[in-house]
Amino acid sequence: VPPGEDSKDVAAPHRQPLTSSERIDKQIRYILDGISALRKETCNKSNMCESSKEALAENNLNLPKMAEKDGCFQSGFNEETCLVKIITGLLEFEVYLEYLQNRFESSEEQARAVQMSTKVLIQFLQKKAKNLDAITTPDPTTNASLLTKLQAQNQWLQDMTTHLILRSFKEFLQSSLRALRQM
C-alpha cells in the first residue's frame, strides 16, 4: 500500500497530517522497500548480484548518479542544486523503470508499484522546487529508442541491465533521501 493509503492512517484521525517533507521521506522509503523486493527476485534468479562483470555492462548504461558537483553530499551541500539533480535524475530513471516492467514474474505488481510511486514522488518534489526552469525533461524520442535497444539485448545482458538499474536506482534514492533530510 503506498504511503498515505495505509489503513492504519485512516483508523487514526488524531494523528497529525504528514508535512511535505515527511510525505516525501515516506514515499522514498516505500519505493526503496519495493526495490528491495525486486532485487531479491533478481538475485535469487541469477548470480548477477555477485558478478564482477557488472562494470563492463555499466559502461553502456547512462544511469543517473550522484556526484559531488550535484550539491547533495555533505561536502558542498546546496539545497537548490541538489533538488534539481534529484528531480532530473528521477525523470531520467523513468525510462529504465519502464524497461523493468516486463522483467519480473512473481513481482510484476511490485515493479508497477515502484514505477507509479516514482511518478508520485516526482510530483511531490516538483511542488517543493523553486527553480523548475533548471529541470530538463528527457526527450521522448531518445527514450523510446533507448527502450528498444535495451529490449533487444541478449538474455544475459538483460539480466545484468535489470540488476544494474535496481542497484543504481536504490543508490540514487538513498543519496536523495539523505540529502532531502538535510533540507
Epitope: 521521506d25 522514498i28 526503496l32 536504490k170
Partner: antibody, heavy 123, light 107 residues
C-alpha cells in the same frame, strides 16, 4: 562469518597524522555503508564518519571535518580513515562498523563492530 | 544539528525489574533511531534498529518504541547479563549523534 579488523592505531604527537585501516571479510563489502565510531577513555560513543556504497558520498562529525578523510577500496574490501592535524581530544579507541544498509535499505544501525584500534595523541 | 538527550544517565534496578531508558531528539528523526548495549571492555552490540525492530539474536525482553522525537528502550525482566551501558543513535540527519549513555547497575 562477518569480520572487521582494524589496524594502524598508535601513539602520535599533536599535529601528526595516522591512517587507520579496516579489513572486512565474510560479506559483500561493496554493498554496505561503513562507519567509523570512536570512544574516548571512560567516555561515550561518538559517530565520526560514514561512507556510502557506490556513490562516494561521505559524511563527517563537526569535530573532525576538514581533518579526517574516510575512503574505501571495494576491490580490497578495506575501509580507511586518514587522520591529519591530530589533537589530544582525538585520543580514543576507533571502531570500524558495518551499517545495516545492505539489507534494510533506509535504516541506520551498526550491526557488526571491529574490536577497535587505540589512537593516542600526546606529546 | 540534532541533539539527543538520553535519560537517566544511570539507574539501579533489581533482577527481574522492568527498566525503561528514554531518548529525546531535539527535532523529528522519524524512526531513524537505534539502541546499543556495551559491557565493560567489550564492543557495542546493536539491540534495536528503526526505533522498534529487534536485531536478530537479541532476546525478546528488549523492546523499542517511539517515533518523531521521543523514544524508549525497555528491558522487561532485567537479567544479570543486561548490566551494561546503553546508547541511542540518531541516523536521520548528518551529523549522526549518539546519546550520552545510560549505565544500568544492580540495586
Amino acid at each position: 562469518q562477518v569480520q572487521l579488523v582494524e589496524s594502524g592505531g598508535g601513539l602520535v604527537q599533536p599535529g601528526g597524522s595516522l591512517r587507520l585501516s579496516c579489513a572486512a571479510s565474510g560479506f559483500t563489502f561493496s554493498n554496505y555503508y561503513m562507519t567509523w565510531v570512536r570512544q574516548a577513555p571512560g567516555k561515550g560513543l561518538e559517530w565520526v564518519s560514514s561512507i556510502y556504497s557506490f556513490s562516494g558520498d561521505t559524511a563527517y562529525a563537526d569535530s573532525v571535518k576538514g581533518r579526517f578523510t574516510i575512503s574505501r577500496d571495494n576491490a580490497k574490501n578495506t575501509l580507511y580513515l586518514q587522520m591529519n592535524s591530530l589533537k589530544s581530544e582525538d585520543t580514543a579507541v576507533y571502531y570500524c562498523t558495518r551499517n545495516l544498509g545492505g539489507v534494510v535499505v533506509t535504516t541506520n544501525g551498526y550491526d557488526y563492530w571491529g574490536q577497535g584500534t587505540q589512537v593516542t595523541v600526546s606529546s | 544539528d540534532i541533539q539527543l538527550t538520553q535519560s537517566p544517565s544511570s539507574l539501579s534496578a533489581s533482577l527481574g525489574d522492568s527498566v525503561t531508558i528514554t531518548c529525546q531528539a531535539s527535532q523529528s528523526i522519524s524512526d531513524e533511531l537505534s539502541w546499543y548495549q556495551q559491557k565493560p571492555g567489550q564492543t557495542p552490540k546493536l539491540l534495536i534498529y528503526g526505533a522498534s525492530k529487534l536485531q536478530t539474536g537479541v532476546p525478546s525482553r528488549f523492546s523499542g518504541s517511539g517515533s518523531g522525537t521521543s523514544f524508549t528502550l525497555t528491558i522487561s525482566g532485567l537479567e544479570a547479563e543486561d548490566l551494561a551501558t546503553y546508547y541511542c543513535l540518531q541516523g536521520y540527519r548528518w551529523p549522526f549523534m549518539f546519546g550520552q549513555g545510560t549505565k544500568v547497575e544492580l540495586k
